[in-house]
């Protein structure tokens, strides 16, 4: 996910409408003029803000990345939606691209999660049934491993 | 690491004011967006306010809205929650956040929050 870059709006656009502040903010699609004294719409597609605020300009829209698919739209109220392409997936603590989910579970494991959107696919010890984490080889490659080499983490 | 500190909870009457502050030990905590975030018992923590990294422009719950003041002073790395005109129903854990990602300027979901300060309580009742 990209934010473009952030610019103070024109404050007299004509199709910007205008209303007045309450207790000195603004409604939800709106911003803040500079003086105080009104409230400018933002702007549908472009620009957004999605509470109470003295924003002095909206926030711009969030432009999906190749690799996401647009779940909703931005609108004057609420931000784009997006979200990973099938087959690939985002963690919250991840950088903040979507990685390939693992086509299988390593040998001695099985499958218990599907890959979704914010997840890999879940593995755990057939026999003991504890997760496994981190970065494991996909079930169809051969697991090589020199003498020394730690095993991989499980939980 | 990041930690984050809240102070100035306590008991207040209602109609009564109280100041919380939020010392943050993070390097980048002049250039993030930062939060807070309140739990009453039994409830979902829910939004209260956020402001931009630069001080310029914050967002407000409409719970709040008129009523709370949030500001930050970049140089001491602390966040600040000016708390007016305060209800039983503002009884709750308050806390501060930082965001996990830099994707949104202005976060304002509990979900887009990684970092939280342990909290501080503020109870208003006569």
């Known amino acids: 996910i990209t934010q473009q870059d952030l610019a103070p709006q024109q404050r007299a656009a004509p199709q910007q409408k205008r209303s007045s502040p309450s207790e000195g903010l603004c409604p939800p699609g709106h911003h803040i003029s500079e003086d105080g004294r009104d409230c400018i719409s933002c702007k549908y597609g472009q620009d957004y803000s999605t509470h109470w605020n003295d924003l002095l300009f909206c926030l711009r829209c969030t432009r999906c990345d190749s690799g996401e698919v647009e779940l909703s739209p931005c609108t004057t109220t609420r931000n784009t939606v997006c979200q990973c392409e099938e087959g690939t997936f985002r963690e919250e603590d991840s950088p903040e691209m979507c990685r390939k989910c693992r086509t299988g579970c390593p040998r001695g494991m099985v499958k218990v999660g599907d890959c979704t959107p914010w997840s890999d696919i879940e593995c755990v010890h057939k026999e003991s049934g504890t997760k496994h984490s981190g970065e494991v080889p996909a079930v169809e490659e051969t697991v090589t491993s020199s003498p020394g080499t730690p095993a991989s983490p499980c939980s | 690491e990041v930690q984050l500190l809240e102070s100035g909870g306590g008991l207040v009457q209602p109609g009564g004011s109280l100041r919380l502050s939020c010392a943050a030990s993070?390097?980048?905590?002049?250039?993030?967006?930062v939060g807070w975030f309140r739990q009453a018992p039994g409830k979902e923590r829910e939004f209260v306010s956020a402001?931009?990294?630069?001080?310029?422009?914050?967002y407000y719950a409409d719970s709040v809205k008129g009523r709370f003041t949030i500001s930050r002073d970049n140089s001491k790395n602390t966040l600040y929650l000016q708390m007016n005109s305060l209800r039983a129903e503002d009884t709750a854990v308050y806390y501060c956040?930082?965001?996990?990602?830099?994707?949104?300027?202005?976060?304002?979901?509990?979900?887009?929050?990684?970092?939280w300060g342990q909290g501080t309580l503020v109870t208003v009742s006569s």
């Open positions: 956040a930082l965001p996990r990602r830099g994707d949104s300027e202005l976060p304002s979901t509990v979900k887009e929050y990684g970092y």
């Open positions: 993070v390097s980048t905590f002049g250039t993030s967006p």
């Open positions: 402001i931009r990294w630069d001080g310029v422009g914050a």
